[in-house]
């Protein structure tokens, strides 16, 4: 067991042209924080793959406001080290991801926003117990300077933190077969402590806490003799005496995965699928607790009061991921009501509203009939974000306030002349036409296309249109 420690020295513009703009401004003050993710081996895994060796978050740095016109300086950093505890052996080779996050504090729609400013990654060889290693990494126009080391937690020692040391039982020498612990010459290397109850005759261990069985024995503590009477489990080597396969100890026997992890066999060994909040070969590492503030974007951290218990982030609407670090494509939720156009600006969500709607999410229907009167006996008709007035005869306009000119639409056909009348309009038809709108031709023999005109009204006389 041990701790990986990371010290950030500076984060600022890198050398050369194209200095980045300061991430903070007078309008949008901000502060930085860092996240480190460690994986064993020289893996080239995606940034999203589990941080199998552990992960840690820094505290928030001091609030910074850019001085107008000044170039972006090195930004103020959080205090303290980032520490990633590991329970297993230190692998010697590891991959790291260090992320620089910006927390904007300005009063904008949606409140503060978190955004990833820079991400650096690398693969390194490192022996535990060695001195601090210094490093410089660049991400775009930004430069990150940092140091790191791995140190063992007593009683573990060695370059992999797998040897255990105990105070000497006798002042002069260590027990049989046990060497002095360098550099702690006053202590002795302790025998490996296998899993509690592991059979001393049939079991052994190469790592503290494990129990591996000698041939012919199985079970989590190597106390169960392998049965030769049945051939139900064809896993082990062939037995010449029985002519069938003897089940050898399976890598998932006794479930080596801690903290509720589930074990699955692989061609060479086993693999643990760990519950959220646990990492490591056997799900034994919980590098992050609620005290580290692992939930981004206003996520609520539950559980995880100490490194041995898992934490869960309850994400606010709009965010997802085990740390609420992934922003949902917020426009996919169609947050802009009533046909508004959605714009996800990263730090905020904007809606461009259709005519007749307003509000941050176009939720305010400006054109509804509530409290809106149509004049002169008109009635309001609502629908689809627009209201209109259905006006009484002789009135028009948006609110029926305008006296309608009934002749404006030239309603009299075939050259008839239109006259406005208190109850509507009157058409004076040209010779040869009749009807309310002069729409019917008069036949030469005096008959019309319609029944005869009403009594007392000669064809060609003006007719009132009611």
């Amino acid at each position: 067991a041990g701790v990986f420690e990371l010290q950030i020295h500076s984060f600022g513009p890198g050398p050369g042209p194209g200095a980045p703009r300061s991430p903070c401004s007078a309008r949008l003050p901000c502060r930085l924080f860092f996240r480190v993710c460690l994986k064993p081996g020289l893996s080239e895994e995606a940034a999203e793959s589990p941080c199998a060796l552990g992960a840690a978050l820094s505290a928030r740095g001091p609030v910074y406001t850019e001085q107008p016109g000044a170039p972006a300086p090195d930004l103020p950093l959080p205090d303290g080290l980032l520490q990633v505890p590991f329970r297993d052996a230190w692998p010697g080779t590891f991959s790291f991801i260090i992320e620089t996050w910006r927390e904007e504090l300005g009063d904008q729609i949606g409140g503060p926003a978190w955004s990833l400013l820079a991400r650096v990654a690398g693969r390194r060889r490192l022996a535990a117990g060695g001195p601090w290693a210094r490093d410089i990494q660049r991400a775009g126009a930004w430069e990150l300077r940092f140091s790191y080391r791995a140190r063992c937690e007593p009683p573990a020692v060695g370059t992999a933190c797998t040897r255990l040391c105990r105070p000497r039982s006798a002042p002069s020498r260590c027990g049989p077969g046990l060497r002095p612990c360098a550099p702690l010459e006053d202590e002795c290397e302790a025998p490996l402590v296998c899993r509690a109850g592991c059979s001393p005759e049939h079991g052994f261990c190469e790592q503290p806490g494990e129990c591996r069985c000698l041939e012919g024995w199985t079970g989590p503590l190597c106390t169960v003799p392998v049965s030769t009477s049945s051939c139900l489990s064809p896993r082990g080597p062939s037995s010449a005496t029985t002519g069938c396969l003897v089940p050898g100890p399976g890598p998932c026997d006794g479930n080596p995965c801690a903290n509720g992890g589930s074990c699955s066999e692989t061609p060479r060994s086993f693999e643990c699928t760990c519950p959220r909040g646990f990492y490591g070969l056997r799900c034994e590492v919980s590098g992050v607790t609620c005290a580290d503030g692992p939930c981004f974007n206003g996520g609520l951290c539950v559980g995880g009061a100490d490194p041995d218990s898992a934490y869960i982030c309850h994400c606010p609407p709009g965010f997802q991921g085990s740390n609420c670090e992934k922003r949902v494509d917020r426009c996919s939720l169609q947050p802009c009501r009533n046909g508004g156009l959605c714009l996800d600006l990263g730090h905020a969500l904007r809606c461009r509203c259709r005519a007749g709607f307003a509000g941050p999410r176009c939720e305010h229907d400006l054109d509804d009939c509530a409290g809106r009167a149509c004049a002169n006996g008109g009635t309001c008709v609502e629908g689809g974000g627009a209201h209109r007035c259905s006006c009484a005869l002789g009135f028009g306009g948006r609110d029926c306030r305008e006296r309608a000119d009934p002749c404006a639409a030239r309603p009299c056909a075939h050259g008839g002349r239109c006259y406005a009348h208190f109850s509507g309009l009157v058409c004076a038809c040209a010779p040869g036409y009749m009807g309310a709108r002069c729409e019917f031709p008069v036949h030469p023999d005096g008959a019309s296309a319609l029944p005869a005109a009403p009594p007392g009204l000669r064809p060609g006389d003006p007719q009132r249109y009611l």
Epitope: D107, Q108, I109, G110, G111, P112, N297, G298, P316, P317, G318, R330, L333, Q334, P335, R337, N338, A348, L349, G359, P360, R361, E363, H364, D365
Partner: antibody, heavy 121, light 107 residues
Framework: EVQLVESGGGLVQPGGSLRLSCAAS????????IHWVRQAPGKGLEWVAY????????YYADTVKGRFTISRDNAKNSLYLQMNSLRAEDTAVYYC??????????????WGQGTTVTVSS | DIQMTQSPSSLSASVGDRVTITCRAS??????LNWYQQKPGKAPKLLIY???RLHSGVPSRFSGSGSGTDFTLTISSLQPEDFATYYC?????????FGGGTKVEIK
Amino acid sequence: EVQLVESGGGLVQPGGSLRLSCAASGFTFSDYGIHWVRQAPGKGLEWVAYISSGGYTIYYADTVKGRFTISRDNAKNSLYLQMNSLRAEDTAVYYCARGDYEDIFYTMDYWGQGTTVTVSS
Amino acid sequence: DIQMTQSPSSLSASVGDRVTITCRASRDITKFLNWYQQKPGKAPKLLIYYTSRLHSGVPSRFSGSGSGTDFTLTISSLQPEDFATYYCQQGNTLPWTFGGGTKVEIK
């Protein structure tokens, strides 16, 4: 833990005034819009007013428009509802409720315990 | 204003029953429909937002569905603590409006 605590309720005569307060804790108050919702005795819920995180957007129900004023003080993590020209029909338990982050859904995700307003002569 | 109509207004059920409550909007509200639970003398609690998303800490026996104008809240296996009044609320267009409530009582 998100907590909202209302205060300021009481008995008032018709035409009188009252100022309700809502003290917030357990979250970044200035990140969230807040609603006032009321519930008349034995009745359902009625939305009353809303104020956005920065206080720039304010909405009222038609039944209280012109009589009630919603405001907030982000430095004090406090929300207020100034109620003037009170009527008998304003008698209810008044709740303050937190809106969702960024007002994408216009939910009320956490509620206070309520404060009772009684308008009677 | 958008009217929200809940049905039934009350129902009696036993522990373990599957319970369904419906909510109808007078106009299209897409998926901006939220459900709340209220127990006597207590403040309402958010159960489901955006039609079907469970609020944090809400048991998975609660589920929601629907879109447009017709929505449903389902409790797959009623528990003793679920006897309460349930309200729907639209978050699409001002003013925000609630349904009249559905009281779930013990049979």
